[in-house]
Interface confidence: low
């Protein structure tokens, strides 16, 4: 009938009872008319059920789009929403009708026996028990059993709504087997149908395989894989396994629930797959799937099956490792093998033990590599079952960036006499040896600190414009000698020397050494003075307990007031705008010393004597003199080094040796110590006397026995002695062969 109507905006259908809620008594007739602008339909409570035959919907006699709904003799169960709507639209008018039946205040469900409420135990979830009411303002409580518990609306999380039912936090009734609603009317109790409480869960938290990875076996061994599913409570789990050889004879699957701690919020299920004797066809991917119906989670692992136990080095195993001093070195033992091998590391044949500097395990780790770690490292892998062994040698080369020996003698400026020839030295130790050592220079006044420049202890010279020594214009005439190579303290060092032909100008000189792993530099302050001159008597470097005199000589006609000072222990402060070593300008850091004055025809000589020099006497000594005319102070600094007394030690070992009669034996015994020790040789504890066949050279360091005889066999001892004691090494020389008879016998 609505076909062809113009497309105008529709008004809501209009109900004959203009109320949202209508309350009527049971056994009366409900009649509502609905009018609109196009075809209408009605919806009413339970209109999917057989109760439809009581409900009558008729066309109105007085209008085109009008329908009347009639229910004679209404009952409590007719309570609910009555809706009149335009077909195929959302436009509707609704009235909620309460049929007040005090004998049946709750609207019965369709089944009329019992309902089911599904709940989860989540603390934050609420559940609605659908006990709708035929009366809007009932006092309803919820009864749960067993044990019996009653819940009443609290105006917060527990409530009852006649159109919706009873709302309550689900955890409050999760213990119960059943619940029902109860209303009290005039001291009479009325109950809704029973609702069975079903606590459900579906969530699987995780599925874990154990072992989880790296499973390796050899043919015939047993495989046991555990699959554990962790779920929320009240979940049932089905396990499903997928594996390579499904037709396995010896396969066994066991599923069980695991006990969890009381109060735990989760359940655990375990499925164990066992294959008693694996074959090569059992190699592959094993997948365990756990399903709760609403959710499935799975996990996989790869099982490798070897024909037999074996061990081999992996292709990535290094043969050469290069490192720089101070670095952390890691040499992993890369292997293929089953079962995992026992790993033992050796250095030059000696077993390595783990300590705080080295860890010898699957990875050989040297925490802070030093030169002495250079060498051949052997890793031996042993299969624990077959005892098969594999070995591999890794050469470790430790590089050392250039270190300049003299750099450690950090001292203020030594002063150099005007016009003298001087040699400056840089002794460089580096592995590999430096590929170049270059010298640079700069005038002292050009390198004075600008007020804006900060000076650090590590770089006290903020000089930037270094000039090559080839360009010595305006400076001292220089010659760089060819590098020398020397064995110093048992190390091969490169010595570079720079010769200053005549000390005319104060300058700074820098040597710079570079090798493949770094660079090192030393700045030498070359301060030229026309002032006093310091000499040491009797020696440049005294040993402790020896006596030494420092002589300061100055021209009497030019200088006066000669004074000896010693620099205090704290480093000289460098003030902005001054030269790197302003000793004369800063007498606060100096200690005045007692000294004796001598004079000859031209010079004053101030002698400061140190009797029984000790290590505490080391340091920088300053001689200060004043210009008679200008009163300007001149000072010269000399660093005094006192050598420590060191008991004799013998480096290296004498080796036992076997020699045939008539051959020669040559052995050396290198001793060190301060004062230098005397070396003596003994045979069978008796002093060895030189003769035509026994030759001692180089201060007895080298012993040669020419054309050895049977009587030369015995225990040879090299002994190095000084006032501080003795050191000795021994070796047994065995002489083989028959002694030839001589004509004299």
């Amino acid at each position: 009938a609505s076909v062809g109507l113009p497309s105008v905006s529709l008004d809501l259908p209009r109900l004959s009872i203009q109320k949202d809620i209508l309350t009527i008594k049971a056994n009366t007739t409900l009649q509502i008319t609905c009018r609109g602008q196009r075809d209408l339909d009605w919806l009413w409570p339970n209109n999917q059920s057989g109760s439809e035959q009581r409900v009558e919907v008729t066309e109105c006699s007085d209008g085109l789009f009008c329908k009347t709904l009639t229910i004679p003799k209404v009952i409590g169960n007719d309570t609910g929403a009555y809706k009149c709507f335009y077909r195929e639209t959302d436009l509707a008018s609704v009235i909620y009708v309460y049929v007040q039946d005090y004998r049946s205040p709750f609207i019965a469900s369709v089944s009329d026996q019992h309902g089911v409420v599904y709940i989860t135990e989540n603390k934050n979830k609420t559940v609605v028990i659908p006990c709708l009411g035929s009366i809007s303002n009932l006092n309803v409580s919820l009864c749960a059993r067993y044990p019996e518990k009653r819940f009443v609306p609290d105006g917060n999380r527990i409530s009852w709504d006649s159109k919706k039912g009873f709302t309550i936090p689900s955890y409050m009734i999760s213990y119960a087997g059943m619940v029902f609603c109860e209303a009290k009317i005039n001291d009479e109790s009325y109950q809704s149908i029973m609702y069975i409480v079903v606590v459900v869960g579906y969530r699987i938290y995780d599925v874990v395989l154990s072992p989880s990875h790296g499973i390796e076996l050899s043919v015939g061994e047993k495989l046991v894989l555990n699959c554990t599913a962790r779920t929320e409570l009240n979940v049932g789990i089905d396990f499903n396994w997928e594996y390579p050889s499904s037709k396995h004879q010896h396969k066994k699957l066991v599923n069980r629930d695991l006990k969890t701690q009381s109060g735990s919020e989760m359940k655990k299920f375990l499925s164990t797959l066992t294959i008693d004797g694996v074959t090569r066809s059992d190699q592959g991917l094993y997948t365990c799937a756990a399903s709760s119906g609403l959710m499935t989670k799975k996990n996989s692992t790869f099982v490798r099956v070897h024909e037999k136990p074996f061990v081999a080095f992996g292709s990535g195993m290094e043969s050469l490792v290069e490192a720089t001093v101070g670095e952390r070195v890691r040499i992993p033992a890369k292997y293929l093998g089953y079962p995992p091998p026992e790993i033992k590391w050796y250095k030059n044949g000696i077993p390595l033990e783990s300590n705080h500097t080295i860890k010898a395990g699957h990875v050989l780790t040297i925490m802070e590599v030093s030169e002495r770690d250079t060498g051949n490292y052997t890793v031996i892998l042993t299969n624990p079952i077959s005892k098969e062994k594999q070995s591999h040698v890794v050469s470790l080369v430790v590089y050392v960036p250039p270190q300049i020996g003299e750099k450690s003698l950090i001292s203020p400026v030594d002063s150099y006499q005007y016009g003298t020839t001087q040699t400056l030295t840089c002794t460089v130790y580096a592995i590999p040896p430096p590929h170049h050592i270059h010298w640079y220079w700069q005038l002292e006044e050009e390198c004075a600190n600008e007020p804006s420049q900060a000076v650090s202890v590590t770089n006290p010279y903020p000089c930037e414009e270094w000039r090559s020594v080839e360009d010595f214009q305006g400076g001292n005439k220089i010659e760089v000698n060819k590098n020398q190579f020397a064995l110093i303290e048992g190390k091969n060092k490169t010595v570079s020397t720079l010769v200053i032909q005549a000390a005319n100008v104060s300058a700074l000189y820098k040597c710079e050494a570079v090798n493949k792993v770094g660079r090192g530099e030393r700045v030498i302050s070359f301060h030229v003075t026309r002032g006093p001159e310091i000499t040491l008597q009797p020696d440049m470097q005294p040993t402790e307990q020896e006596s030494v005199s420092l002589w300061c000589t100055a021209d009497r006609s030019t200088f006066e007031n000669l004074t000896w000072y010693k620099l205090g222990p704290q480093p000289l402060p460098i003030h902005v705008g001054e030269l790197p070593t302003p000793v004369c300008k800063n007498l606060d850091t100096l200690w005045k010393l007692n000294a004796t004055m001598f004079s000859n025809s031209t010079n004053d000589i101030l002698i400061m004597e140190l009797k029984n020099a000790s290590l505490q006497d080391q340091g920088d000594y300053v001689c200060l003199a004043q210009d008679r005319k200008t009163k300007k102070r001149h000072c010269v600094v000399r660093q005094l080094t006192v050598l420590e007394r060191v008991a004799p030690t013998i480096t290296g070992n004498l080796e036992n040796q076997t020699t045939s009669i008539g051959e020669s034996i040559e052995v050396s015994c290198t001793a060190s110590g301060n004062p230098p020790p005397q070396i003596m040789w003994f045979k069978d504890n008796e002093t060895l006397v030189e003769d035509s066949g026994i030759v001692l050279k180089d201060g007895n360091r080298n012993l040669t026995i020419r054309r050895v005889r049977k009587e030369d066999e015995g225990l040879y001892t090299c002994q190095a002695c000084s006032v501080l004691g003795c050191a000795k090494v021994e070796a047994f020389f065995i002489i083989e062969g028959a002694q030839e008879k001589t004509n004299l016998e």
């Epitope: 033990e353 624990p384 036992n656």
Partner: antibody, heavy 123, light 111 residues
Framework: QVQLVESGAEVKKPGASVKVSCKAS????????MHWVRQAPGQGLEWMGI????????SYAQKFQGRVTMTRDTSTSTVYMELSSLRSEDTAVYYC????????????????WGKGTTVTVSS | QSVVTQPPSVSGAPGQRVTISCTGS?????????VHWYKQLPGTAPKLLIY???NRPSGVPDRFSGSKSGTSASLAITGLQAEDEADYYC???????????FGTGTKVTVL
Amino acid sequence: QVQLVESGAEVKKPGASVKVSCKASGYTFTSYYMHWVRQAPGQGLEWMGIINPSGGSTSYAQKFQGRVTMTRDTSTSTVYMELSSLRSEDTAVYYCAREGANAPNSYYYMDVWGKGTTVTVSS
Amino acid sequence: QSVVTQPPSVSGAPGQRVTISCTGSSSNIGAGYDVHWYKQLPGTAPKLLIYGNNNRPSGVPDRFSGSKSGTSASLAITGLQAEDEADYYCQSYDSSLSEGVFGTGTKVTVL
């Protein structure tokens, strides 16, 4: 040649302690482990413990735990074995023995032995 | 009580072959640890005879040989000689005790 020289015979009272020394020569002392083994009169060999002369680490047989102490002095290439709370059943010959180094996985084999020190415990 | 056992004595005529057994368990010989053999003459220190199951140190005649299988090992002496009369001890390492273990010892008599 490689030699292990032990200290002289000792007679001790029950409850006392004994310290036996073993001086090594002819090889690099810190490169080889040292074992102590004892043999009671008419009985078999009994392993007591091992010391690493390089680091000084030790491992003792459970039977002697708490009573035995093994130490070394690298400056004299000497190892020491001290046994305390002596009882008559500790009467035995005490040997020091160097561990061989030919086979990396051959644990605890002894290629050079000292002549032994006789310790007699008697009241 | 030793965890590694040997027969108390074996004997043989000169020129004969004798074997000494050495029985351990899964924590020593059976765990793969090597077996070593020592010879001890009366009143002297033991001397290494075989190391690493079957290796002879220099100076030991090839009449002596060692073998190992499972949890036991054996020492064979072929062409028995008068100077072979001595006590023989096997030795291994026990991982459960974490210590070296000697066998009970076997006296070899040359008839």
